[in-house]
């Protein structure tokens, strides 16, 4: 948990953050793990510590190894480990897997590719971007702040993207490159404000005392894979788990995707052995996603076991 892999290329700048976090005012000491030798803080050194950051300006293959950082708060010392590997520059264009940062996915609506680790560096715009080693040219590509935007993304835009920028330290410039894969999602999904299909707003559900009852909360959130969507039940404004009535439980229903492509979710509320006091509760079906929350309220009413209607007025 408190160990982090970092990598870079020889003769480029590499800045590593201690995996243990702390207030900016905390002292952080860095050591070579093997020798326990302290890493200097003087900036005249090629490798030096600067608070939570360890800086290799520039990095050398021999710098590879494990580094220990100790974050010293007034109350605790917390230890972290940075596993650093510096690789020789490749002569050919291929970027090996071990130099790749996490893959990002894009679609027609969202095609941002963030330059990995750039927030650790003192850099100035613009960034240079390359795809499969070719400099990106054309109006479809826009380097904006720390990310690349691709207009009208097509499946052919998938590939390895490298950002290149200059880190400045006390007037000296150092080059940094970072590469990640970009994949294009075919599905043109979208999300919208939740639509609750059931129950109807202010629905009255008839139940029989002593019998079991089920209430289904069903809502749709858009088309395609939804980043964040949930349906749940509340009792008198309280989560089911916090309400503390073991007879009343919620159970996830089917994740539905209808023929029209809508992504919908169900949550079934199961009430065992319905009691009189259950009729006094307010049952809220909640559907929420990034757009917001929609709530439909249901109340229970007593259904007589034999409901004979009088034929007399």
């Amino acid at each position: 948990k408190f160990s982090k892999q970092s990598w870079g290329l020889e003769n480029e700048a590499l800045i590593v953050r201690c995996p243990r976090q702390g207030k900016p005012s905390y002292t952080v000491d860095w050591y070579y793990s093997q020798t326990n030798k302290s890493i200097p803080t003087q900036e005249r050194n090629r490798v030096f510590a600067s608070g939570q950051l360890l800086k290799f300006l520039p990095a050398a293959v021999a710098d590879s190894g494990i580094y220990t950082c100790i974050v010293r708060s007034p109350t605790f010392n917390r230890t972290g480990y940075a596993n650093v590997t510096i690789y020789k520059k490749q002569s050919d264009c291929n970027v090996p897997d071990y130099l790749m940062y996490s893959t990002v996915s894009g679609s027609e609506k969202n095609s941002k590719i963030y330059c990995p680790t750039i927030d650790l560096y003192n850099w100035t715009a613009p960034l240079e971007w390359f795809k499969n080693c070719q400099a990106l040219q054309g109006s479809r590509y826009r380097a904006h702040k720390s990310f690349l935007v691709i207009d009208n993304v097509m499946t052919e835009d998938a590939g390895d993207y490298t950002c290149k920028f200059i880190h400045n330290e006390n007037g000296a410039n150092y080059s940094v490159t970072a590469t990640r894969s970009f994949t294009v999602k075919d599905e043109q999904g979208f999300s919208l404000f939740p639509v609750i299909g059931a129950p109807a707003q202010n629905e009255i559900k008839e139940v029989e005392i002593g019998k079991n009852a089920n209430l289904t909360c069903s809502a749709c959130f858009g088309k395609g894979t939804q980043f964040l969507a949930a349906v749940l039940w509340q009792l008198n404004g309280t989560k089911i788990t916090d309400f503390g009535e073991p007879r009343i439980q919620q159970e996830e229903g089917q994740n539905q995707s209808f023929s029209n492509g809508l992504a919908c979710l169900d949550m079934v509320l199961r009430i065992a052995d319905v009691k009189e006091e259950d009729l006094l509760l307010q049952y809220d079906c909640l559907a929420l996603n990034l757009h917001g929350l929609r709530r439909h309220t249901v109340r229970l009413s007593r259904k007589n076991p034999i409901d004979h209607h009088s034929i007399y007025c």
């Epitope: 976090q21 702390g22 207030k23 005012s25 905390y26 708060s73 007034p74 109350t75 605790f76």
Partner: antibody, heavy 121, light 107 residues
Amino acid sequence: QVQLQQSGAELVRPGASVTLSCKASGYTFTDYEMHWVKQTPVHGLDWIGTIDPETGDTAYNQKFKGRATLTADKSSSTAYMELSSLTSEDSAVYYCTRYSYTNSPYGMDYWGQGTSVTVSS
Amino acid sequence: DVVMTQTPKFLLVSAGDRVTITCKASQSVSNDVAWYQQKPGQSPKLLIYYASNRYTGVPDRFTGSGYGTDFTFTINTVQAEDLAVYFCQQDYSSPYTFGGGTKLEIK
């Protein structure tokens, strides 16, 4: 939402011990330190100590060292403080408070409702 | 231990007044100072952290400043709901210590 639910009021005899609990919910228990603070009308707020629930490491105010024992149960997200050899000076309201040290805001950003302890024979 | 000397102990003000509370540390505590508000019958609430940063949801009439040993907390336009005790606290060195508190009363 973040909540720190403390145990109920205690009436204890001098010389006895008391254990107070603080149940955390609405956040990752191990990502924050849990601190304990004593409040009396005369002395105001007094920091007792802190526990890192991730590791179980503790740090105490020398004033309370040896009498206060802080523990944490990760499985139930509950912090405990045991105070021993009680005297009337220990009659106070005791608060548990979450301390954010990894990201802003840095400080005691959420407090329990407090537990009143009365030491009396 | 770092002693946080908070003044004044009491403040009697009218709604709309500007209020200033000071806290003096017995040694430098950098900017590791927080300010808390405690309303009657309630737990303390964080208002200011890192000497001058307003906590989420805190109205902008509350401000903090200072560095080293001298810290100031200001309420620009006091409102009736600001009736409370205000505490400063340092977390620069252990044990963390609090000021004695300032009781704010509204005329």
